[in-house]
């Protein structure tokens, strides 16, 4: 086909000789053509719709990629001749750097359904060269990691040695989709979630007297986990006193948040303090009530069959521990004013004689 009508874009890949890095070309078909083949969200906000009608397609066919040999030979089908280049929907992925990737790459829809479609193509002139050794030592890596739950940033490798003030306007893409919220050489992430992982592309324009080039770099971002630096946090009980009715059953719940630990051995137990005595209570097994990649919330209840007068003189303590340290929360029971009659009080006193049976000591839970 005649490629003279294709829109043209010049790209520069300055690769680091010290690292393995990838490169990506997007098939930037004009609007509305592109929307039929790629995600609309890939388009830059400055693109103006082209009014040529373009055949609609319900099954969103892929685009076809070609490489134009420099000697004027016919176009080569990428898939047949270049095993290190992977074609995926509207992107072309170069798995290995090298000046041999320099050349012209053409993309167009696979399915040509109208006379207008013939001119629907993009020619990308790619120049590939090794980064000069004069480049700064601490340039950002093409593989960057973000710690889950913390703050972090993703830096554009080709601009990481420049201050934010001197940095040109940058266009960012994540997994092929335009990120319109930032034009800086760094994406700041307030809190890292798993969805922040992916393939990021940063583009900026470099101009000389003769022409203008888009300098592009690709960053693989992983979200990583690490052991918490915090002791567990008791979420419940919040109050140190609890109003109760004598003679009635009572359940006190202890809920605690444990931060991520690669080797997870949470301890959660209830014990009772009575004057100078202190003993651990046999209570139902702890259970995980919410688990995320960042933390886990565990609950364990203490159950009193009937609240007695003696219980009002005791302190109920929830104890939680991880490898960093422990946290406790004490609860004192307080009789509800105006609650219960004489029968309840007699019943509660009767139970006091048997209450030692309720508490067996030493029970550990390991999650």
């Amino acid at each position: 086909f005649n490629i003279s009508g294709c829109s043209t874009k010049k790209l520069l890949w300055a690769y680091s000789t010290r690292s393995e890095e990838e490169f990506i070309l997007f098939c930037d078909l004009p609007e509305p053509q592109k929307s039929h083949f790629c995600h609309r969200s890939q388009l830059s906000p400055t693109q103006v719709p082209d009014h040529l009608p373009f055949t609609d397609s319900k099954d969103l066919p892929d685009v076809q990629w070609y490489r134009q040999p420099s000697n004027g030979d016919p176009l080569e089908d990428i898939r047949k001749s270049y095993p290190h280049i992977i074609q995926d929907k509207c992107t072309l992925r170069f798995l290995t750097p090298g000046v041999n990737n320099t050349g012209s790459y053409i993309c167009r829809p696979k399915m040509i359904k109208s006379p207008y479609d013939v001119a629907c193509c993009v020619k990308m002139i790619l120049e590939v060269k090794p980064q000069s050794n004069a480049s700064c030592e601490n340039s950002a890596s093409h593989k960057q990691d973000l710690l889950l739950g913390s703050t972090g940033s993703i830096s554009c490798p080709s601009l990481s040695c420049q201050s934010d003030a001197q940095s040109p306007e940058v266009t960012w893409y994540k997994n092929g989709k335009l990120l319109s919220m930032t034009r800086s050489n760094r994406i700041v992430v307030d809190e890292v979630y798993i969805y922040h992982q992916g393939t990021y592309v940063c583009d900026y324009t470099q101009s000389d007297t003769a022409s203008s080039w888009t300098v592009r770099a690709v960053v693989q971002v992983r979200t990583i986990v690490g052991d918490t630096k915090l002791k567990p946090d008791i979420l419940d009980p919040v109050e140190s006193t609890l109003e109760v009715e004598l003679g009635k059953p009572l359940t006190i719940s202890c809920k605690a948040r444990f931060g991520f630990e690669r080797v997870f051995n949470p301890v959660m137990k209830w014990y009772i303090k009575d004057a100078d005595l202190e003993w651990e209570v046999s209570v139902p097994e702890a259970k995980s009530i919410k688990s995320t990649l960042k933390d886990e919330i565990i609950e364990r209840n203490i159950i009193l069959e009937k609240v007695t007068q003696r219980d009002l003189r005791r302190t109920f303590v929830c104890f939680v521990q991880n490898s960093i340290g422990n946290t406790t929360q004490s609860v004192q029971l307080k009789e509800k004013r105006g609650s219960g009659g004489l029968n309840d009080i007699f019943e509660a006193q009767k139970i006091e004689w048997h209450e030692t049976v309720r508490f067996q000591s030493h029970h550990h839970h390991h999650h």
């Epitope: 890596s141 990691d145 710690l147 889950l148 913390s150 798993i194 992982q197 992983r222 979200t223 990583i224 986990v225 690490g226 052991d227 630096k229 630990e261 690669r262 080797v263 990649l293 490898s323 960093i324």
Partner: antibody, heavy 124, light 107 residues
Framework: QVQLQESGPGLVKPSETLSLTCTVS????????WSWIRQPPGKGLEWIGY???????NYNPSLKSRVTISVDTSKNQFSLKLSSVTAADTAVYYC??????????????????WGQGTTVTVSS | AIQLTQSPSSLSASVGDRVTITCRAS??????LAWYQQKPGKAPKFLIY???SLESGVPSRFSGSGSGTDFTLTISSLQPEDFATYYC?????????FGQGTRLEIK
């Protein structure tokens, strides 16, 4: 790019303590786990233990009583001490970055960057 | 400790051959398995994680499969630089353990 370099004596006497240091360059020690692995001559790989940059450790039970791994974030270094060594501790000792990667609803761990290894011989 | 048994212990093959190495765990480890390549006098190099995911920069001729107790590493078309020793590693439970290795030699 992150690079690791092991350093320490190549010869240790039996019953003494083997001490090695791994220096991390081209990146931060923060946010990662750091492991020690060894390989006796002509044999396979044996994991010794890891430390998280904040200081939490986990050791191979077969060596636990003799191993201490520590970290110095200010120097971007972590260290291995193995006490009461015998000839069976003769090996190439590697340090590695041991990263926990979050994926969907789980994690996987990989040793994605390794030092070039240092040979330690235990002999009198 | 979970034991990983690799088979074969060694094999000879030619450039262009398709090669499969297996790794069997003594108990289920889900997909918590990685593969490493080690050349003589060098440190191991990480190839595959989570049983089947290829590390970026690793040639696509390498692939991994399996979950539970049985895993395989396949090299679809051997290249001269692929002759090395391959190790599987589990991180499902502690201690972390490695297979005994499979030595891949030129026929």
């Amino acid at each position: 790019q992150v690079q690791l370099q092991e350093s320490g004596p190549g010869l240790v006497k039996p019953s003494e303590t083997l001490s090695l240091t791994c220096t991390v360059s081209g990146g931060s020690i923060n946010n990662y786990y750091w492991s020690w692995i060894r390989q006796p001559p002509g044999k396979g790989l044996e994991w010794i233990g890891y430390i998280f940059y904040s200081g939490t450790t986990n050791y191979n039970p077969s060596l636990k009583s003799r191993v201490t791994i520590s970290v110095d974030t200010s120097k971007n270094q972590f260290s291995l001490k193995l006490s009461s060594v015998t000839a069976a501790d003769t090996a190439v000792y590697y340090c590695a970055r041991d990263v926990g990667i979050a994926a969907r609803n789980s994690y996987y761990y990989v040793m994605d960057v390794w030092g070039q290894g240092t040979t330690v011989t235990v002999s009198s | 400790a979970i034991q990983l048994t690799q088979s074969p212990s060694s094999l000879s093959a030619s450039v262009g051959d398709r090669v499969t190495i297996t790794c069997r765990a003594s108990q289920g480890i889900s997909s918590a398995l990685a593969w490493y390549q080690q050349k003589p006098g060098k440190a191991p190099k990480f190839l595959i994680y989570e049983g089947s995911s290829l590390e970026s920069g690793v040639p696509s001729r390498f692939s991994g499969s399996g979950s539970g107790t049985d895993f395989t590493l396949t090299i679809s078309s051997l290249q001269p630089e692929d002759f090395a020793t391959y190790y599987c590693q589990q991180f499902n439970s502690y201690p972390i353990t490695f297979g005994q290795g499979t030595r891949l030699e030129i026929k």
